[in-house]
Interface confidence: low
């Protein structure tokens, strides 16, 4: 009857990048299925991923409603073939997730250099503003819209002929740097939220882009 042979989920883990947020857990089900519930700490539980045989559940739609809220999730285990109408009153085993605050904890996705333009001894480097699934007034917001000045970019640049790197920072999506005339430079950017004190304060570096390739434009 009820949940006799089901086991509770474990290793509940939030995987979140640029607010795309998935809850993962173990074990791979054998003769059981899962239902996930998510809640803000002051709200009601909402069920998602009903009776799934997966060990992950995309909760993005819930967390983007308020990325500064703190969320909890729990994963219930049911026997395979379970339907609500079976009339079982037995509590299914469940496990709670760690708490998750998207604004503080979502990982920053790898940024992309959109373009760079050289004018004399100046180069303007533009970072592509990534779109997120966070909405305001039915409009999707960019990473910059969400984080505002909390988000900065660090530019690493170096002469193609040398390994010595220089850095620049901006709290917009553009850099204006000085370069030596006649030299080719390579660029890589990293997204950073300086106010974070955890491992997720920086993104991975963008792919390297070098002058003399298609993204660049040169004007005297």
């Amino acid at each position: 009857s009820g949940t006799t042979n089901t086991v509770a989920a474990y290793n509940l883990t939030w995987k979140s990048t640029n607010f795309k947020t998935i809850l993962e857990w173990e074990p791979k089900p054998i003769n059981q299925v899962y239902t996930v519930q998510i809640s803000t700490k002051s709200g009601d539980w909402k069920s998602k991923c009903f009776y799934t045989a997966d060990t992950e559940c995309d909760l993005t739609d819930e967390i983007v409603k308020d990325v500064k809220q703190t969320y909890l999730a729990r994963v219930f285990s049911y026997p395979a073939g379970h339907v609500e109408s079976t009339g079982s009153t037995e509590e299914p085993p469940y496990e709670n997730s760690p708490e998750f605050t998207p604004y503080l904890e979502t990982n920053l996705g790898q940024p992309t250099i959109q373009s760079f333009e050289q004018v004399g001894t100046k180069v303007n480097v533009t970072v592509q503003d990534e779109w997120t699934l966070v909405r305001r007034n039915d409009t999707f917001l960019s990473l910059r819209d969400v984080f505002g000045k909390d988000l900065i970019y660090t530019l690493y640049y170096w002469k193609s002929s040398s390994s010595g790197k220089k850095t620049a920072k901006t709290n917009t999506n553009e850099f204006l740097i000085d370069v030596d005339k006649g030299e080719n430079y390579c660029f890589s950017v990293q997204a950073v939220i300086p106010s974070r004190r955890t491992a997720n304060r920086k993104s991975t570096d963008s792919p390297v882009e070098c002058m003399g390739h298609e993204k660049g434009e040169s004007r005297e």
Epitope: A8, N11, S39, K41, S42, W45, E91, E95, N96, P98, E99, F100, E105, T198
Partner: antibody, heavy 117, light 112 residues
Framework: QVQVVESGGGLVKPGGSLRLSCAAS????????MSWIRQAPGKGLEWIGI???????YYADSVKGRFTISRNTNENTVYLQMNSLRAEDTAVYYC???????????WGQGTLVTVSS | ELVMTQSPPTLSLSPGERVTLSCRAS????????LSWYQQKPGQAPRLLIY???KLATSIPARFSGSGSGTQFTLTISSLQPEDFAVYYC????????????FGQGTKVEIK
């Protein structure tokens, strides 16, 4: 074997400081919420504070500003730094894993802290 | 802040009797069910009996059961055994921008 072991208790003068340690084995503290609870002689249990699996800390009003919980995930150890100690802080101090709703709940045997001149 | 109130403070009973302990929260515990019961014997650390208001912890005998929701909770021992004489604590969880955890003052179950 999954267990937690507290250490660092002893006699300290009022106004003094003490750091308690909670060494965990058989599991990773970075995956669990770890709490400190105390029990004064002949009294009930009192929750002191918690460090979440994400490293966030919360404290009881009675110790806010005086006590600090931290952790070293490499050493798999949780700490309770106690400053400005008072006589009423005399108690057995317990470290426990998983207090949110009891799942995965494990308690140590406690360490006695005596605050007296 | 969350305050947990247990009643009665002391119960004098004989083995075999049915025991009902009460715990009241000053406001609804988180999720209406984040309420645990612990047993503590002299010189020992507390031992978890019930979590989630009604779920039996690992290796706890089935004579222990929990019920309730929101602010009112009950621990029942269907038939008191000699090893059950101890102090019982309820512990609730509350959230209001910060987490709060609070224990009741305890109910001592002693031999009559």
């Amino acid at each position: 074997q999954v267990q937690v072991v507290e250490s660092g208790g002893g006699l300290v003068k009022p106004g003094g400081s003490l750091r308690l340690s909670c060494a965990a084995s058989g599991f990773s503290i970075s995956s669990y919420d770890m709490s400190w609870i105390r029990q004064a002689p002949g009294k009930g249990l009192e929750w002191i504070g918690i460090i979440g699996s994400n490293g966030r800390t919360y404290y009881a009003d009675s110790v806010k500003g005086r006590f600090t919980i931290s952790r070293n995930t490499n050493e798999n150890t949780v700490y309770l730094q106690m400053n400005s100690l008072r006589a009423e802080d005399t108690a057995v101090y317990y470290c426990a894993r998983g207090l949110y709703d009891g799942t995965g709940n494990i308690w140590g045997q406690g360490t006695l802290v005596t605050v007296s001149s | 802040e969350l305050v947990m109130t247990q009643s009665p403070p002391t119960l004098s009973l004989s083995p075999g009797e049915r025991v009902t302990l009460s715990c009241r929260a000053s406001q609804s515990v988180y999720g209406n069910n984040w309420l645990s019961w612990y047993q503590q014997k002299p010189g020992q650390a507390p031992r978890l009996l019930i979590y989630g208001a009604s779920k039996l912890a690992t290796s706890i005998p089935a004579r222990f059961s929990g019920s309730g929701s929101g602010t009112q909770f009950t621990l029942t021992i269907s038939s008191l055994q000699p090893e059950d004489f101890a102090v019982y604590y309820c512990q609730g969880t509350y959230y209001s921008g910060d987490w709060y955890f609070a224990f009741g003052q305890g109910t001592k179950v002693e031999i009559k």
